[in-house]
Interface confidence: low
Amino acid sequence: SQVSNLLKQQQTNLTHQKNKLEGQISARQQAEEASQESQNELKEMIETLAWKLNEKSKEQMELHHQNLNLQETLKRVANCSAPCPQDWIWHEENCYLFSTGSFNWEKSQEKCLSLDAKLLKINSTADLDFIQQAISYSSFPFWMGLSRRNPSYPWLWEDGSPLMPHLFRIRGAVSQTYPSGTCAYIQRGAVYAENCILAAFSICQKKANLRAQ
Amino acid sequence: SQVSNLLKQQQTNLTHQKNKLEGQISARQQAEEASQESQNELKEMIETLAWKLNEKSKEQMELHHQNLNLQETLKRVANCSAPCPQDWIWHEENCYLFSTGSFNWEKSQEKCLSLDAKLLKINSTADLDFIQQAISYSSFPFWMGLSRRNPSYPWLWEDGSPLMPHLFRIRGAVSQTYPSGTCAYIQRGAVYAENCILAAFSICQKKANLRAQ
């Protein structure tokens, strides 16, 4: 009977523990369901945010393209409405740019070409007057687009046209032969012949945009 | 003894059930911890996405403003005639003319005024860079619109505004007193103080015409 009582007591304890555990499991199950629900909500939230982010990226990309197009148009239009680009001098029918670096004749020619221009070409005494005045405050030489292969060749402009003899007299190394040819520079209003491999400033020239505004 | 056996059997069952439940609880606990961890990761993910979205929104806003500005500028520029007169250099918002004659400061000022301009005013390091580059091939001095009555007075631009001290250091005759005042000239990129009565080249400046016509 004593054993029996002890067993009954243990049984009661175990039943109590079992019920308690079942309760805990039930509670955990509910919590788990809630957690699962919350996790699903979070996943949904992530999906929404990821979608929004993707949309924003698309919009941004679109805006960026718009922006680039506008900048491109602006460049075009700015150059359309202005006779000459920024930093160039507009004179009569031409735009002139005085280089800010010293290079040999060929490199100077390349620099002008990259700006959709050519080295200076003097067509008239009026052109010469303007250039002489524009460089009057410089003691440095400026390459122009005039060169010849050697003294037995004629002086030619970049476009292949010959130099008009009445325009100016070329001084300096006119009878010298150089492997890279002889090129003309203008300095303090006078034009000189020199070895094309030497470094000098240069003057680029292109047609001014004088279409109806 | 029969009761005892029955109780023992029930006890064994209960113990078995209890162990099973405890195992379940343990498993659920682990699952819960894993779920918690996963939830934390999801929350972190959400935070990151939300931050990215916010950044994207800011960038987009900025791009949007840039776009509006570009559109505005485009409208303005599209209706522009030449930003600067012939022989002037257009740079950013201004037109610059490098004089072809040497005069004292006052006479230089008059010459600029007659062209509806003022002597050079440098507002920023960008302005200074442009001017330094533009005169890089000259070794001559150019008057700018900066002067002072004597060393106890501040350096003032023609419009009365003071010189920003960080822009450049003025060299030369800074502590000298001249009856005609002290004026500033720029030469080979550096700014010097000199007697205003001396003759030098000069740089005129006026606003570029970028308004809608």
Epitope: F103, N104, E106, K107, S139, F140, P141, G172, A173, Q176, Y178, P179, S180, G181, Q187, R188, A190, Y192, E194, N195, C196, I197, L198, A199 | S139
Partner: antibody, heavy 115, light 107 residues
């Protein structure tokens, strides 16, 4: 920074040739010509000629024409000056220098011509 | 060829003195003139180019002037490190010729 580093001293017999190198660094080699100047012991400076590394075009002083050759290897930014049919009066320090005016110079290479 | 003649060929001076070296070309060289300084066993160093432009890093006590065929190098106040040989060179027409040099010695 800009540097021109020349090859070491040479001792040659009359009639032989010498090739002096000049390695450039610190700037775009093809943008600036390289000049060669020599200085006999206790004497002044004498310009020999120049090469433009971009085009390979060279100009030589008349007195060296036919004896001097200036070349370059743009892949290693190096200019060369070769002087042939050496005579005892070619004994000198040979300098390479950049551009005109010559703003950077090599350290010089002593070429001794002696039998 | 253009001949370049420097004078004097040597000059003795003291620290603090003002020294002038002249260079005459056999024809006008349109300011295409440079001045170099050379110390024993060293390569020449560019001081002045385009007749009057000071090379960066060169002390302002050195100055150049002149036009046409006549040019001058001036050292306003001699410093111990200025004792050296000075050369002028024209770079208008090849061959680019040098003056024979002026040796500046301590008095």
């Amino acid at each position: 920074q800009v540097q021109l580093v020349q090859s070491g001293a040479e001792v040659k017999k009359p009639g032989a040739s010498v090739k002096v190198s000049c390695k450039a660094s610190g700037y775009t080699f093809t943008d600036y010509e390289v000049h060669w100047v020599r200085q006999a012991p206790g004497q002044g400076l004498e310009w020999m000629g120049a090469i433009h590394p971009g085009s390979g075009g060279a100009a030589y002083v008349q007195k060296f024409q036919g004896r001097v050759t200036m070349t370059r290897d743009t892949s290693i930014s190096t200019a060369y000056m070769e002087l042939s049919r050496l005579r005892s009066d070619d004994t000198a320090v040979y300098y390479c220098a950049r551009w005109l005016p010559m703003d950077y110079w090599g350290q010089g290479t002593l070429v001794t011509v002696s039998s | 060829d253009i001949q370049m003649t420097q004078s004097p060929s040597s000059v003795s001076a003291s620290v603090g003195d003002r020294v002038t070296i002249t260079c005459r070309a056999s024809q006008g060289i349109n300011n295409w003139l440079v001045w170099y300084q050379q110390k024993p066993g060293k390569a020449p160093k560019l001081l002045i180019y385009a007749a009057s432009s000071l090379q960066s890093g060169v002390p302002s006590r050195f100055s150049g002037s002149g036009s046409g065929a006549d040019y001058t190098l001036t050292i306003s106040s001699l410093q111990p490190e200025d004792f050296a040989t000075y050369y002028c060179q024209q770079y208008l027409i090849t061959p680019y010729t040098f003056g024979q040099g002026t040796k500046l010695e301590i008095k």
